[in-house]
């Protein structure tokens, strides 16, 4: 039950996180005009990964796409790439995790396969979250660097009568959305990985074996076995009751070498 809850919660948290990463990537407010030097401007500037916008006090907003690839800063391209990789990995992770959910039955899928898929999706979510956090952090670092550079420029060479106030940019809402979304995806991924451990069918201490003796039906339970070497450690025990006897484990699922990863 706890495993199902952990897996389900991990999926939901990751889903919210990836939706947030997509939203952040599409948002225009990655950087917004810093109004410290000109708080009374009638024109407000903000920029995203794909276009820059100008909002006038009148309510009119004008956006222009970056219709060039080669002319854009390498850092911006890197951030775009990180965010897209994050989205793609997250989307694949979501697809995989849907089939891995314990509450969803698809044919005769074994628990071992579900465990593997849960782990795979968990790792994908972790990498997706890290990509988003890295992308947003790179952009934030770029903003901080440019902010202080333009501040330095602002206070040099102002001896003339004409002031040319350089537009400075500060953190936009998309950065915070990206950080939170990346964090959620990461947490969701970790939860999936934790759920994977619980999903992997461990061998129990007591093997329940039933066999038929002539005249009586007796349930015989050999005790005292501790699986010390993983799967296959009790094969001798199983072979004793070959004549029609089955362990409870054999009835439910067949152990596989993939169960522990």
């Amino acid at each position: 039950m706890a495993v199902t809850a952990c897996q389900g919660l991990g999926f939901v948290v990751s889903l919210i996180g990836i939706a947030g990463i997509i939203a952040a990537t599409c948002m225009d407010q990655w950087s917004t005009q810093d109004l410290y030097n000109n708080p009374v401007t009638a024109v407000f500037n903000y920029q995203g990964l794909w276009r820059s916008c100008v909002r006038e006090s009148s309510g009119f907003t004008e956006c222009r796409g970056y219709f060039t690839l080669l002319g854009l800063p390498a850092m911006l391209q890197a951030v775009r790439a990180l965010m897209i990789v994050g989205i793609v990995l997250g989307a694949i992770g979501l697809l995989v995790s849907i089939f891995a959910l314990k509450c969803i039955r698809i044919g005769s899928m074994e628990d071992s396969a579900k465990a593997n898929m849960t782990l795979t999706s968990g790792i994908m979510f972790i990498v997706s979250g890290l990509c988003a956090i890295a992308g947003v952090s790179v952009f934030a670092n770029m903003l901080v660097t440019n902010f202080w550079m333009s501040t330095a420029n602002m206070y040099t060479g102002m001896g003339g009568m004409v002031q040319t106030v350089q537009t400075r940019y500060t953190f936009g809402a998309a950065l915070f959305v990206g950080w939170v979304a990346g964090g959620l995806t990461l947490i969701g991924g970790v939860m999936m990985c934790i759920a994977c451990r619980g999903l992997a069918p461990e061998e129990t201490n007591y093997k329940a074996v039933s066999y038929h003796a002539s005249g009586h039906s007796v349930a015989y339970k050999p005790g005292g076995f501790k699986a010390s070497t993983g799967f296959g450690s009790n094969t001798k025990n199983k072979k004793i009751y070959d004549g029609g006897a089955r362990t409870e484990d054999e009835v439910q699922s067949y152990p596989s070498k993939h169960d522990y990863v």
Partner: antibody, heavy 116, light 113 residues
Framework: QVQLKESGPGLVAPSQSLSITCTVS????????VHWVRQPPGKGLEWLGV???????NYNIALMSRLSISKDNSKSQVFLKMNSLQTDDTAMYYC??????????WGQGTSVTVSS | DIVMTQSPSSLTVTAGEKVTMTCKSS????????????LTWYQQKPGQPPKLLIY???TRESGVPDRFTGSGSGTDFTLTISILQAEDLAVYYC?????????FGSGTKLEIK
């Protein structure tokens, strides 16, 4: 067509307050902002303030303490209220429609004289 | 506040001549985000309210004759009347609409000989 018409008291005693109404037609106040501009006799134009479609306002800092702009969208009216008038507030007061921060349509103006 | 300085303060010219007046702002009116200069030119004829001529420094308002041309960027702007006509007798104002308060220049009074 677009029209703006100012109506005011004409004469105001010093230290009294001034109220001017700008009645608009041909456009909606929920879509356009309205500016207030004044012009003392024989002098240049002075921007007073603006009220935007959402109801938010911006004022000339020099007059901010005694200036108030409001509106009634349903009546298509914009109101200018100015307190503590002095003789140098004597001017022609205009309201004008905003279009992308420029003023494309102006009213004929209302003359305000501050005198005892 | 942005200070708008217009020159000359008055100008006496003959009909048919080319007229140029300038407007300087104490701060750049160029918005880097959309490459627009938030400067507007108005014409005010005697006894009338001002009339919008040019916005964004160079975009002519519809209905304005093409003899009126606005140019310039940043802090230096020019209004040119290519062939002056008698009806152009007016005061011309430039206005900053980039930063509050929206300040006007003191105007250039155009008189015809």
């Amino acid at each position: 067509q677009v029209q703006l018409k100012e109506s005011g008291p004409g004469l105001v005693a010093p230290s009294q307050s001034l109220s001017i109404t700008c009645t608009v037609s041909g456009f909606s106040l929920t879509s356009y902002g309205v500016h207030w501009v004044r012009q003392p006799p024989g002098k240049g134009l002075e921007w007073l303030g603006v009220i935007w479609p959402g109801g938010n306002t911006n004022y000339n800092i020099a007059l901010m303490s005694r200036l108030s702009i409001s509106k009634d969208n349903s009546k298509s009216q914009v109101f200018l209220k100015m307190n503590s008038l002095q003789t140098d507030d004597t001017a022609m007061y205009y309201c004008a429609r905003d279009r992308r921060l420029a003023m494309d349509y102006w009213g004929q103006g209302t003359s305000v004289t501050v005198s005892s | 506040d942005i200070v708008m300085t217009q020159s000359p303060s008055s100008l006496t010219v003959t009909a048919g001549e080319k007229v140029t007046m300038t407007c300087k702002s104490s701060q750049s009116l160029l918005e880097s985000g959309n490459q627009k200069n938030y400067l507007t030119w108005y014409q005010q004829k005697p006894g009338q309210p001002p009339k919008l001529l040019i916005y964004w420094a160079s975009t002519r308002e519809s209905g304005v004759p093409d003899r009126f041309t606005g140019s310039g960027s940043g802090t230096d702007f020019t209004l040119t009347i290519s062939i002056l006509q008698a009806e152009d007798l007016a005061v011309y104002y430039c206005q900053n609409d980039y930063s509050y308060p929206f300040t006007f220049g003191s105007g250039t009074k155009l008189e015809i000989k």
